[in-house]
Every structure is written in C-alpha cells, then in structure tokens.
C-alpha cells in the first residue's frame, strides 16, 4: 500500500511457525453460531520488480494510486476458505501448510497459521469471515525476517581467545529487549553481566574463553509488539 | 460490457409488495456476490441487503429485516429483492450492484437504478 | 454499526483547483474504505477502493489515503467533469455503510 494507507504489521521469522491473528469481536448473539461460521483468507503478495501489471483475478483490473515507479501488485489468491459445513479450499503447494485452529475457530478466532512460513508468504493478507447475519474482516500485513547470529572472530577458537557473538534479526526497529542464555542439560541458563561476560545491546563479548564455553549459546529478541525471536550458536573451543 | 439493468420499480401502496429484478451481462454472475443499495430522493446511499456468490450466506439492514428477501437464479443470471410490508420511508432509487469480491465488501458496477415509490 | 462521517458537506472550487474530502470512521476499519463518485441522475461510480487503490479507469488525479479512522479523498487539478457528490463507505464490516455525501459545487 500506498504510504498513508497501512494495515497492522505482523512480523514472523522465516522458517518458523507464523500466526496470522484474526479475532473480530463478535457479538455475544453470534457466539453459538460459529459453527456455521465461514472464513477465506486471502493473499496479496508484496510487488516485484515492475513489469505488465496482472489483471484482477476476478473483476476489472485495479490500479494502486501510487507513484507509476511502484512495481505492480502480484494477482491475489484464496489461501484457504472454510465454508460453513467445515468444507475447505486453497490453493497448493501453500495449503499443505497452512491451518485453521478448528476448536479455535468455535471460540471466535480465526488466525491463519503458517507452518513454516515462507519468504514469498510476505504481503498483505485480508480474512473475510462470514458469520450467520454480518461479516467482518481482519487485514493485516505480513513482513518475514531473518534471524542470525553471528561470531568475531569466527570458526573455532582456542582458549584464552576473545570472541564476540552478535544476534541479529532483519527488521528495522531495535529490539526492545535481549536476552542471552546457555542451554546446559537442566535446560537454559540466563547470561548475566560478569568479569567473563560482558552485554551490549545485541552483543555478548567473552574476553578470555575456554573449553567450558564450548557448546550452544542463544539469545531472545523481544520487540515492541511482542514478536520474540530465539537463536542458538554452536560455540567451538579448542582445548 | 459489463451490464446491471434493474426493472419492477413503481408506485405502491403502503402494506403492498413489489419486487425488484436485476438482469446481468458481460461477466460470470454466479462468480460474484451481489447487493442491493438505495438512495431516497435527495439523500444518501443506504445499504439494504447482499447475497455471496454461492447463495450461503445473506444479509439485511435492520431497516429491511423480516420484509425484504434477496434471492439470485444463477442460471438466468438475475438477482431480485422481494420486499413486502412496503412503507413511505423505502421509496427510493433501487440500485442492483455488483460485490468485488466476496471477501472485499465494496461496489464495482452499478445498475441504472429503478425507482419504488411508496404513497397512498 | 460503524459511522461514516463526511466533511464538508459541501465544497465550491474552481476548475484546476485541489480538492480534498474527509471521511471519519466511528471505529477503527483499517484500509477497508471506498470512494464513489455520483451525477445528478446518474448510479454511483466507483473511484478509490481499500483507502489508496485507484479503480480502473479512473483518472489519477484522484487519489486516497488514510487508515484507522481518518481517510481522505483528493483530487489534485479540478476538472469540468469532477463537479459531483462524493460519498465514502467502509467496507471492513457488515452492515456496509456510507458517508452522506459532499456535493463539489463550480464556484
């Protein structure tokens, strides 16, 4: 969408699970009628390079009042409709992974899971939900980001050498929170600030470094609008 | 082209019934959901009622609900409205109008409109 | 249901002159508003669908913003042909519902 004309973000990691929430506020009236219930999600992928823009799918062809160097929108699709009797369509080779929460969608939502989600599952997504007398809607944009952690110096180290691991994940806005964690047999250990272990922000510097600290080290990114990210390094020390 | 031609309008008595028909042309009819909209002479448009393309699901202004029927006969590729218990506030210009999209509530084609006057 | 509301109610301006319509929801509707456009006698055309995309075939000095609860209609260089009313309308949620209209009136 044009800037100005912006839907709620939902951000999700690629290659992990990503729900898509939708959770319209239905009259209490309604509540014993969503077995009935019907909903189809569709998908509006985020625009390419330019090129000749696809026709509507359905009706005339749409034009996004915005600038002539936008790329054109990608034809959107039904990811996956349920009908009333529970019958279901999409389209392949997305719906194998995706779900409907079938006892959730009795409670009134109707999150679309994607297990895993992909790069190409970024874009706008809109959930038309059709209940016995009124239909509602969600919209809402999905952005997909990397996660990675990363060491300097990389590889195996030796002990007494200095390494710093930095955890990253590719979305504009700093995290509003990092934790880093060891996972040691009993489970995960928290990482405090210590003579061997000093934080910054997304940063975990270990200035002397031994056999001890070979072995998985991870962090959680927390942001703002609650998405939570977790990454794990291998650390390799060399006796 | 792309065609909505509603016909059935006319003048009625407070209490009567008429009832509205909608002949579509230039597209697959059973393809899309359809809606009825009215606009009282020098006011607003008003919403009155919507079908989904495959008949399951539909939809009335409480102003309408329990008076009004919309039906579709896909093989005729026609829609109608049924309205019974017809009262002075309905007169209108009855508008048959094409749904996006069944998931996407806004109003791509219009027809021309037929007027329903209701007056003793 | 969710209230549409207009301003102004009416406008008079000039051919070339940029025009802009607002349009205020009772609720939060995200993107989910259209604009129409109507002559006198005449249906209502669709212009501006999902707050920012033009419909086919329509000129692109129109062109619409907003999200949440404020949406805008503007039109950038006034044309002979653009003296209407105009009326937005939600279409996040049943029942489906329409601004009352903003009459463009020649100065």
């Known amino acids: 969408l044009q800037p100005g004309a912006e839907v709620p973000v939902v951000w999700a990691q690629e290659g992990a699970p990503a729900q898509l929430p939708c959770s319209p506020t239905i009259p209490l009236q309604d509540l014993s009628l969503l077995r009935r219930a019907g909903v189809t999600w569709q998908h509006q992928p985020d625009s390419g390079p330019p090129a000749a823009a696809p026709g509507h799918p359905l009706a005339p062809g749409p034009h996004p009042a915005a600038p002539s160097s936008w790329g054109p929108r990608p034809r959107r699709y039904t990811v996956l409709s349920v009908g009333p009797g529970g019958l279901r369509s999409g389209r392949l080779p997305l719906q194998p992974r995706v779900q409907l929460d079938e006892r959730g969608r009795q409670r009134g939502d109707f999150s679309l899971w994607l297990r895993p989600a992909r790069r190409a599952d970024a874009g706008e997504y809109r959930a038309a939900v059709h209940l016995r007398d009124r239909a509602l809607s969600c919209r809402l944009r999905l952005r997909l980001g990397q996660a990675s952690m990363t060491a300097s110096p990389p590889g195996s180290l030796r002990a007494s050498d200095w390494v710093i691991l930095n955890c990253s994940f590719s979305r504009p806005d700093r995290p509003a929170s990092v934790h880093w964690f060891r996972n040691r047999g009993q489970g995960r250990v928290p990482v405090r600030e210590s003579p061997h272990h000093h934080l910054a922000e997304s940063f975990l510097f270990l200035p002397q470094v031994s056999p001890m600290d070979s072995g998985p080290w991870g962090c959680i990114l927390t942001y703002r609008d609650g998405f939570n990210v977790s990454i794990m390094y291998n650390l390799t020390v060399l006796g | 082209q792309v065609q909505l031609v509603e016909s059935g309008g006319g003048l009625v008595k407070p209490g009567g019934s008429l009832r509205l028909s909608c002949a579509a042309s230039?597209?697959?009819?059973?393809?899309?959901?359809m809606s009825w909209i009215r606009q009282a002479p020098g006011k607003g448009l008003e919403w009155v009622s919507y079908v989904t393309s495959g008949g399951d699901y539909i939809y009335y202004a409480d102003t309408v609900k329990g008076r009004f029927t919309i039906s579709r006969d896909d093989a005729k590729n026609s829609l109608y409205l049924q309205m019974n218990s017809l009262r002075a506030e309905d007169t209108a210009v009855y508008y048959c109008?094409?749904?996006?999209?069944?998931?996407?509530?806004?109003?791509?084609?219009w027809g021309q409109g037929t007027l329903v006057t209701v007056s003793s | 249901d969710i209230q549409m509301t207009q301003s102004p109610s009416s406008v008079s301006a000039s051919v070339g002159d940029r025009v802009t319509i607002t349009c205020k929801a009772s609720q939060d509707v995200t993107t989910a508003v259209a604009w129409y456009q109507q002559k006198p006698g005449k249906a209502p055309k669709l212009l501006i669908y999902s707050a920012s995309y033009r419909y086919t075939g329509v000129p692109s000095r129109f062109s619409g913003s907003g999200s949440g609860t404020d949406f805008t209609l503007t039109i950038s260089s006034l044309q002979p042909e653009d003296f209407a009313t105009y009326y937005c309308q939600q279409h996040d949620s049943s029942p489906w519902t329409f601004g009352q209209g903003t009459k463009l009136e020649i100065k």
């Open positions: 230039g597209f697959t009819f059973s393809s899309y959901a």
């Open positions: 109008t094409r749904v996006a999209y069944d998931y996407e509530w806004y109003f791509d084609v």
